[in-house]
């Protein structure tokens, strides 16, 4: 058993049929010695008396808020949560496996630049009695500070018969060094509590591996005289690291017909303009990627050819 | 060339070669971001590689003030990785293909280090750890880790030379 926060404790249980469970001793936080009784949740049934209560925790019915009283007055509370381990693996019932980039990916994180700011998100089908708390650091043995905000519900989607909820959190490295080569990864730890179930999820990454620039901005077309060609121009997104002579992007320009089946013409360039042939009813799209490190491409910025 | 006394390197040549290094490093081990860092095990060899750190002067301001600190750091790293890529970790089984990008990477690391340091002047270099796994699969995993860390190193070096070529070239 360990303390998650004040008066909240996590009991780690091997979860299998007829498992013996864990013996837990609760102590009433009071100078009083006599006349103390214990109850669980809203029940008035007295579970025991005395300053300590020994219980065998085997299942969710044994978890909950234990309260010690004296003469009708509440002295203190201890909330017991369960953390299940099945076949040596901690349960992951609360969050949905996003399966991208690979199986068992529960947390996904992205950064728009090298400033040390990043966003992580996760999915669940649970709508109520759910809380999250997020901690982060750079490195684990001698951790350096990363400050995370509160996790918030950022999107709701209907997936078949189910509703899916997306939560996200923003974090900022306290002393970020955008130009340095990272040697210690960022660690992100999410504590999830649903009713009386506790789970924790972790992710470990370098900022450079989660970079995804915003799409290029101010995408414009300039027709070239007496030609089907157009000059496409764009700018670096505002959110990208500066100076651009140091933090450079590379771009992919795509001409795509109305039908998805039509062949796409693609050009790669380090410049912020390109000359392409504009077909009728086609659109021109541009996306960006770090020039020197193959992290994710941005989403496309698009304009119609006409 | 980054010679003692602080004359400038051939920024544009260094830029071109460092950008080629980036391409080669990614070709040698293309899908890197998907490796889970916690599954990799802390291997001494990749912990001991020289990193371009915050105080090394490789940021735009540091380069403007005095690019020598940064260039020396980059040179150290280039020599270190050049030695690693020529070591038994890469020459042992499983053999590399004769036209392997690792071979070209090795040659390009040497080429860039020579652009930075003319013969006759020697910056301090770091010893490479003598750790060669006996099993081919261990060697393979170590190769991937080294290439992964090289990708990060050459990305910073390429930024330095691109910025130098754009703002510090005579």
């Amino acid at each position: 058993i360990w303390e998650l926060k004040k008066d909240v404790y996590v009991v780690e249980l091997d979860w299998y049929p007829d498992a013996p469970g864990e013996m837990v001793v609760l102590t009433c936080d009071t100078p009083e010695e006599d006349g103390i009784t214990w109850t669980l949740d809203q029940s008035s049934e007295v579970l025991g008396s005395g300053k300590t209560l020994t219980i065998q925790v085997k299942e969710f019915g044994d978890a909950g808020q234990y309260t010690c009283h004296k003469g009708g007055e509440v002295l203190s509370h201890s909330l017991l949560l369960l953390h299940k381990k099945e076949d040596g693996i901690w349960s992951t019932d609360i969050l949905k496996d996003q399966k991208e980039p690979k199986n068992k990916t529960f947390l996904r994180c992205e950064a728009k630049n090298y400033s040390g700011r990043f966003t992580c998100w996760w999915l669940t089908t649970i709508s109520t009695d759910l809380t999250f708390s997020v901690k982060s650091s750079r490195g684990s043995s001698d951790p350096q500070g990363v400050t995370c905000g509160a996790a918030t519900l950022s999107a709701e989607r209907v997936r078949g018969d189910n509703k899916e909820y997306e939560y996200s959190v923003e974090c900022q490295e306290d002393s970020a060094c955008p130009a340095a080569e990272e040697s210690l990864p960022i660690e992100v730890m999410v504590d999830a509590v649903h009713k009386l179930k506790y789970e924790n999820y972790t992710s470990s990454f370098f900022i450079r591996d989660i970079i995804k620039p915003d799409p290029p901005k101010n995408l414009q077309l300039k027709p070239l005289k007496n030609s089907r060609q157009v000059e496409v121009s764009w700018e670096y997104p505002d959110t990208w690291s500066t100076p651009h002579s140091y933090f450079s992007l590379t771009f992919c320009v795509q001409v795509q017909g109305k039908s998805k089946r039509e062949k796409k013409d693609r050009v790669f360039t380090d410049k912020t303009s390109a000359t392409v042939i504009c077909r009728k009813n086609a659109s021109i799209s541009v996306r960006a990627q770090d020039r020197y490190y193959s992290s994710s491409w941005s989403e496309w910025a698009s304009v119609p050819c006409s | 060339r980054a010679v003692p006394g602080g004359s400038s390197p051939a920024w544009t040549q260094c830029q071109q070669l460092s950008q080629k290094l980036c391409t080669l490093a990614w070709s040698a081990h293309p899908l890197v971001g998907h490796m889970d860092l916690r599954e990799e095990g802390d291997e001494e060899t990749t912990n001991d590689v020289p990193h371009i750190q915050c105080g090394d002067g490789c940021d735009p301001q540091g380069l403007r003030d005095n690019s020598q600190f940064c260039l020396q750091r980059i040179h150290q790293g280039l020599i270190f990785y050049e030695k690693l890529l020529g070591s038994d970790i890469f020459t042992g089984e499983p053999s590399l293909l004769p036209d392997s990008p690792v071979g070209q990477l090795h040659a390009s690391l040497l080429g860039l280090s020579q652009l930075l340091q003319p013969e006759g002047h020697h910056w301090e270099t770091q010893q490479i750890p003598s750790l060669s796994p006996s099993q081919p699969w261990q060697r393979l995993l170590l190769r991937f880790k080294i290439l992964r860390s090289l990708q990060a190193f050459v990305a910073v070096a390429a930024r330095v030379f691109a910025h130098g070529a754009a703002t510090l070239s005579p």
Epitope: - | T23, L31, M35, P94, L97, D99
Partner: nanobody, 126 residues
Framework: EVQLLESGGGLVQPGGSLRLSCAAS????????IGWFRQAPGKGREGVSC????????YYADSVKGRFTISRDNSKNTVYLQMNSLRPEDTAVYYC???????????????????WGQGTLVTVSS
Amino acid sequence: EVQLLESGGGLVQPGGSLRLSCAASGFTLDYLAIGWFRQAPGKGREGVSCVSSSGQYTYYADSVKGRFTISRDNSKNTVYLQMNSLRPEDTAVYYCATDPECYRVRGYYNGEYDYWGQGTLVTVSS
């Protein structure tokens, strides 16, 4: 970000031929070794063939040696698998993937860190 797209699969009679293509976008194939793999219904994925970055060096699984030929055209960013004398046991979904140093097809490595295409179905049946 490498994207690989296979094409050329289909239904063919035993003894017939097919030519599969693997086109890359998002990255130049110039320095990349590329492998072909296949997965028959209810079976694991197996290495079929691999070609080095220049196209000079090739590897084949014993089961396809002498019947399949791998080649590449770096100017088109495409790798090909010419399949002749096809047999019913060649029926499978065929995938192309990045395979540094052809480690995977050579049997040294079975990790999950490569780029894979979506696959193209080859059915050999009379």
